[in-house]
């Protein structure tokens, strides 16, 4: 009877085990995360000759080493340094495109304008784009059930710290005229709390960056306002100017036409404003 009780208790404990795992508010690690990262690295190095020296095995292991066995609310930028070292890559001057709250259009643009690069066109950004990941303290397991949410759980989680780390590096290495695409449909066109506003803006190097040119993307077809006069854009201008970097702003009234004109600049309709 006593043995039976122990056995039953063990059975209950076994079935309860998944609930003991730390429950976070965010979605869990993306399915097949290791395979996805490795496959993306292989694919990237195949199509980018300048990165063909990169050892994807070491890249994956450095990525994994940044968060595996670590408490997922205590990740630091230091944890990602081995990965950053392996993924070192430079963008030619005048070819950096930052973005805030308008990722899809920024990526559509660099897919057409192949000589310009967003962070997600670089190896490390490409590896992690749209993925979620986290581990658990003192185990070698990846947590596929839940991961910390930036707002509800903690900001020092594996995903947030990764993007902060690589965004900082991306901004630090930019040179010449840097462009940023901003979403004119949002209440805060420039948001100080976005990755662009809190990390990238402050890590542009005045000795290397001559100017920041903002492209404010309009949402409505009939929207003819000059969104470059928006108070948040003026705030961005002030921050940038104080850092001894010149600031320019352009309204992109018709994003569809804008993309079309990037594809076909000779088109007669592209000679007028977009």
């Amino acid at each position: 009877s006593g043995l039976n009780d122990i056995f039953e208790a063990q059975k209950i404990e076994w079935h309860e085990l998944p609930r003991w795992r730390q429950q976070w508010s965010g979605s869990g690690t993306t399915s097949r995360f290791p395979e996805t990262v490795l496959a993306r690295c292989v694919k990237y190095t195949e199509v980018h000759p300048e990165m063909r020296h990169v050892d994807c095995q070491s890249v994956w292991d450095a990525f994994k080493g940044a968060f595996i066995s670590k408490y997922p609310c205590n990740i630091t930028e230091e944890d990602y340094q081995p990965l950053v070292k392996l993924g070192t890559q430079t963008v030619p001057c005048n070819k950096t495109l930052l973005w805030s709250r308008i990722k899809d259009l920024a990526h559509q643009f660099t897919q057409v304008q192949r000589d310009m690069f967003t962070l997600e066109d670089m190896l490390l950004g490409y590896l992690a784009d749209d993925l979620t990941w986290c581990g658990e303290f003192n185990t070698f397991e990846i947590n596929y059930q839940s991961c910390p949410d930036w707002r509800k759980d903690c900001s020092n989680n594996p995903v947030s710290v990764f993007w902060k780390t690589v965004s900082r590096r991306f901004a630090e290495t930019a040179c010449g005229v840097v462009h940023v695409m901003l979403n004119g449909s949002r209440s805060k066109i420039f948001d100080k709390n976005s990755t662009f506003g809190s990390v990238e803006v402050h890590n542009l190097q005045p000795e290397k960056v001559q100017a920041l040119e903002a492209w404010v993307i309009h949402g409505g077809r009939e929207d003819s306002r000059d969104l470059c006069q928006d108070p948040t854009i003026k705030e961005l201008e002030s921050i940038i100017s104080k850092r001894n970097i010149r600031f320019f702003c352009k309204n992109i009234y018709r994003p569809d036409k804008f993309l079309q004109c990037v594809k076909n600049p000779e088109d007669s309709s592209c000679l007028s404003g977009i």
């Epitope: 395979e35 292989v42 063909r52 050892d55 095995q57 070491s58 994956w60 292991d61 080493g65 392996l86």
Partner: antibody, heavy 113, light 112 residues
């Protein structure tokens, strides 16, 4: 850039043996190194790898039978409990995203009672 | 683990002829495949990497093709020095759940 294996010899079954690969002109912190073996008259087979980051992986058949480790200039392969089936030439190789592009000359291990 | 299936195990051809060796991977390895030539008592020699790129100093008579899971090595204008065993190799990478490194069983090429 070169690799050279050493430590191959005649051992009796069950006697642990460590092979060493000494590298020259190679930064082991950024390259994945592997051990490959070839039994007499047979094909090539992977045993395991150690990445630049230092993580080890093994072919399923090799798990528990071999241990790969490294220092800044050497990559070691420990055969934990050799059997006669482990008689082979053992190669140390460098693997890049392009290929396994650099091979040592190999070292012969003979396991016999 | 990845399984590399190489065919045929042996092939015989005359000098000046052409030999084709096939290699099939059990999973998608993109272009992460190499071909090696090995002669008795020697270490393997790299012929082709990235499925189709000729290694430095290798004759253009050796041609690699394919991607994903199906790959081919073609040796044209066969010479007596080409008599050797040829291996395909995957170097796709490893995770805790898969070991993406492996060799095919080898193909012995006999030149008449």
């Amino acid at each position: 850039q070169s690799l050279e294996e050493s430590g191959g010899r005649l051992v009796t079954p069950g006697t642990p043996l460590t092979l060493t690969c000494t590298v020259s002109g190679i930064d082991l912190s950024i390259y994945t190194m592997a051990w490959v073996r070839q039994a007499p008259g047979k094909g090539l087979e992977y045993i395991g790898i150690i990445s630049g980051y230092g993580t080890t992986y093994y072919a399923t058949w090799a798990k528990g039978r071999f241990i790969v480790s490294k220092t800044s200039t050497t990559v070691d392969l420990k055969i934990t409990s050799p059997t006669t089936e482990d008689t082979a030439t053992y190669f140390c190789v460098r693997t890049t995203v392009q290929s396994t592009d650099l091979w040592g000359p190999g070292t012969l291990v003979t396991v016999s009672s | 683990d990845i399984v590399m299936t190489q065919t045929p195990a042996s092939v015989e051809a005359a000098v000046g002829g052409t030999v084709t060796i096939n290699c099939q991977a059990s999973q998608n390895i993109y272009s992460n495949l190499a071909w090696y030539q090995q002669k008795p008592g020697q270490r393997p020699k790299l012929l082709i990497y990235k499925a189709s790129t000729l290694a430095s100093g290798v004759s253009s008579r050796f041609k690699g093709s394919g991607s994903g899971t199906e790959f081919t090595l073609t040796i044209s204008d066969l010479a007596s020095a080409d008599a050797a065993t040829y291996y395909c190799q995957s170097y796709y990478g490893a995770t805790s759940s898969s070991f993406g490194y492996g060799f095919g069983g080898g193909t012995e090429v006999v030149v008449k």
